[in-house]
Amino acid sequence: EDELQVIQPEKSVSVAAGESATLRCAMTSLIPVGPIMWFRGAGAGRELIYNQKEGHFPRVTTVSELTKRNNLDFSISISNITPADAGTYYCVKFRKGSPDDVEFKSGAGTELSVRAKPS
């Protein structure tokens, strides 16, 4: 069986300030079991944007129903974009662990650029 791949098809996305940004992500397999998280940036300084397992992420909506059986689409939409949202976003698959889940595989990233709001 092929190992899971995390696919972020767009290298870059550009939106105007105040608009919503859709960041696409798909998995090639349901295995291993574990949550998906989205981060802005990489390494220790990365910002958690969305955690499928826990937390309240008011500006983020999932494009498809993540709890739906056999769902492989983990795309998100971030509303009311500001300049501080600019950066590279990574869709990351975690493997269920105890006590903490373990990072399994990351997508290649999608760079979000923010244009000035049209006047």
């Epitope: 802005r40 300084g45 990365r46 958690l48 992420f57 500001t82 501080a84 949202d85 709001k117």
Partner: antibody, heavy 119, light 108 residues
Framework: DVQLVESGGGVVRPGESLRLSCAAS????????MNWVRQAPGEGLEWVSR????????DYADSVKGRFTISRDNSKNTLYLQMNSLRAEDTAVYYC????????????WGLGALVTVSS | ETVLTQSPATLSVSPGERATLSCRAS??????LAWHQQKPGQAPRLLIY???NRATGIPDRFSGSGSGTDFTLTISSPQTEDSAVYYC??????????FGGGTKVEIK
């Protein structure tokens, strides 16, 4: 209910150190960026420092850069502020504040801890 | 760096008399502006976020408006318990997070 409770305040001499703690409950602490904000006697609010959800990303006000260190222990649901080389102008009530999401306003505040720097 | 200027510094109104507080940003902050209330001896409390959305549990006599650089907090019919200092906060550009200097509201 979200609760943020600061501790560790007190009276110190200029040049000394102090560590503040903020115990968090009622929300998924590990999912949110946290901040310290201070208020000198009779003055307004001044943002001091921010730490991202994972603890690897930090920001500081110019007035405290190089002297203060923000950190967090997600296993203990606790935020810290290590304050070194304290000055008289650091005298203030220090509040910990939770962010609504990573790029957003402060939706909950602690009750505050008074730090007095005096010779 | 975005500077927030609040006016007036002090506002004295009678109970039931409309109170209007202003916050002006030195550059656009879109709708990314919040208002916090701080009563004497207490911690700040979030009132309004994204310029016009009331936080949970905030009475509807509090309303926010504006976008870009000019924002208003209105207390439609102030009660004695609304005596407090009100701060605006921008979160469009950061760090640093910036607060306005505050408006002290006194209910006569």
């Amino acid at each position: 209910d979200v609760q943020l409770v600061e501790s560790g305040g007190g009276v110190v001499r200029p040049g000394e150190s102090l560590r503040l703690s903020c115990a968090a409950s009622g929300f998924s602490f590990r999912s949110y960026a946290m901040n310290w904000v201070r208020q000198a006697p009779g003055e307004g609010l001044e943002w001091v420092s921010r730490i991202n959800s994972g603890g690897g990303g930090t920001d500081y006000a110019d007035s405290v850069k190089g002297r203060f260190t923000i950190s967090r222990d997600n296993s203990k649901n606790t935020l810290y502020l290590q304050m070194n080389s304290l000055r008289a102008e650091d005298t203030a009530v220090y509040y910990c504040a939770k962010q609504y999401d990573w790029n957003s306003f402060f939706d909950y505040w602690g009750l505050g801890a008074l730090v007095t720097v005096s010779s | 760096e975005t500077v927030l200027t609040q006016s007036p510094a002090t506002l004295s109104v009678s109970p039931g008399e409309r109170a209007t507080l202003s916050c002006r940003a030195s550059q656009t902050v879109g709708s990314k502006l919040a208002w916090h209330q701080q009563k004497p001896g207490q911690a700040p409390r979030l009132l309004i976020y994204d310029a016009s959305n009331r936080a949970t549990g905030i009475p509807d006599r509090f309303s926010g408006s504006g976008s870009g650089t000019d924002f208003t907090l209105t207390i439609s019919s102030p009660q004695t318990e609304d005596s407090a200092v009100y701060y605006c906060q921008q979160y469009y550009y950061w760090p640093p997070y910036r607060f306005g200097g505050g408006t002290k509201v006194e209910i006569k």
